[in-house]
Amino acid sequence: LPAQVAFTPYAPEPGSTCRLREYYDQTAQMCCSKCSPGQHAKVFCTKTSDTVCDSCEDSTYTQLWNWVPECLSCGSRCSSDQVETQACTREQNRICTCRPGWYCALSKQEGCRLCAPLRKCRPGFGVARPGTETSDVVCKPCAPGTFSNTTSSTDICRPHQICNVVAIPGNASMDAVCTSTSPTRSMAPGAVHLPQPVSTRSQHTQPTPEPSTAPSTSFLLPMGPSPPAEGSTGD
């Protein structure tokens, strides 16, 4: 005869363990049913009655089969610098990640605890290492023969255009200005960008320069002194 299937609660055979999705209740000394994800134990089992489970209440969750008396509280609502990438449900906690243009300065088990804005490289400085979901942008001074005239977290240093006759030589923050005759090699219009990090995927490809720090390319006068060595705007 086949062995009979034991229904919870049941006393396990000496030396054996409870089955999958069951737990051993020390008080009842029985194998009892666990509650499914999205539930918690409302009434613990006894020798004669199985665990009574209840659905997780408002804004609480359990992710695993369990016998906890209360569901876990979902984390607080995402802050203004974050987006909710996973909603709080009975079976999963809320996950907040940094919104475009920000990176995670302090992460937690899932999602981010503290977001910070991505550093913007000032004119004269370009992006050496782009920002990611968890790391800030690294800026570097534009090497001789290159420039950046934007305040941006994505623009790299671009080569100066090569002129037949130079009207104004380029510097780190301004392109060379040619005389009316065409340049030998004209740069394509628009800034050169590094690929956007995941956390900035919805940013516009051309960040608007800040007038106070990013001069217009139409100026024909040499620029003033170089910006500070960090090459980034204050956060």
Epitope: C35, S36, P37, K42, S55, D58, S59
Partner: antibody, heavy 117, light 106 residues
């Protein structure tokens, strides 16, 4: 379009049982709990219980424990509620509702159960 | 169980009038949920997480409150708003509904 299609009205005798169905369409059936709500004529709403179609785990309002039994058939995306030992107190409209996680965003049209000899 | 008391039970309002109905819980709740029901129809989700309007709900509706006291407000009554409104809590089991507020057009 998300829809919950409930079975038709039932006229049953006292002491008998009735099994109401609720067929879900337009979404993944196992993604959301299904809840059942009772509304007696001219009265408010009473939560009976819910079932997680994924794990087939249930939770009940203590008042309806032993009175109602919730089950699902995942293959047909259908939830069922059986109500037993019917009395005149069980004459009501019974609704199934999709539980979006602490609110019922879609409701069935309701099944009227009349208990009469 | 957490008893939800809605007041008034019945009220009437003229077109354009501001309407406020309340829902008091015997124990504090995290959020309140509201449903609209018209005669011989199923309830419809109206407001969730205390103040979020369900899709398709006109902007003249709003929800507010915390703890034991919550309310639903219509800034300017329209004919189609005549219905019964129920509040519901999910903070403690069994999940309970209020007795409803029947809103009629004056």
């Amino acid at each position: 379009e998300v829809q919950l299609q409930q079975s038709g009205a039932e006229l049953v005798k006292p002491g008998a049982s009735v099994k109401i169905s609720c067929k879900a369409s337009g979404y993944t059936f196992t993604d959301y709990n299904m809840d059942w709500v009772k509304q007696s004529h001219g009265k408010s709403l009473e939560w009976i219980g819910d079932i997680n179609p994924n794990y087939e785990s249930t939770s009940y309002n203590q008042k309806f424990k032993g009175k109602a039994t919730l089950t699902v058939d995942k293959s047909s995306s259908t939830a069922y509620m059986e109500v037993r030992s019917l009395t005149s107190e069980d004459t009501a409209v019974f609704y199934c509702a999709r539980d979006k996680g602490w609110y019922f965003d879609v409701w069935g049209a309701g099944t009227t159960v009349t208990v009469s000899s | 169980e957490n008893v939800l008391t809605q007041s008034p039970a019945i009220m009437s309002a003229s077109l354009g009038e501001k309407v406020t109905m309340s829902c008091r819980a015997s124990s504090s709740v995290k959020n309140m949920y509201w449903y609209q029901q018209k005669s011989d129809a199923s309830p419809k989700l109206w407001i969730y997480y205390t103040s979020n309007l369900a899709p398709g709900v006109p902007a003249r509706f709003s929800g507010s409150g915390s703890g034991n006291s919550y309310s639903l407000t219509i800034s300017s009554m329209e004919g189609e708003d005549a219905a019964t409104y129920y509040c519901q809590q999910f903070t403690s089991s069994p999940y309970t509904f209020g007795g409803g507020t029947k809103l009629e057009l004056k």
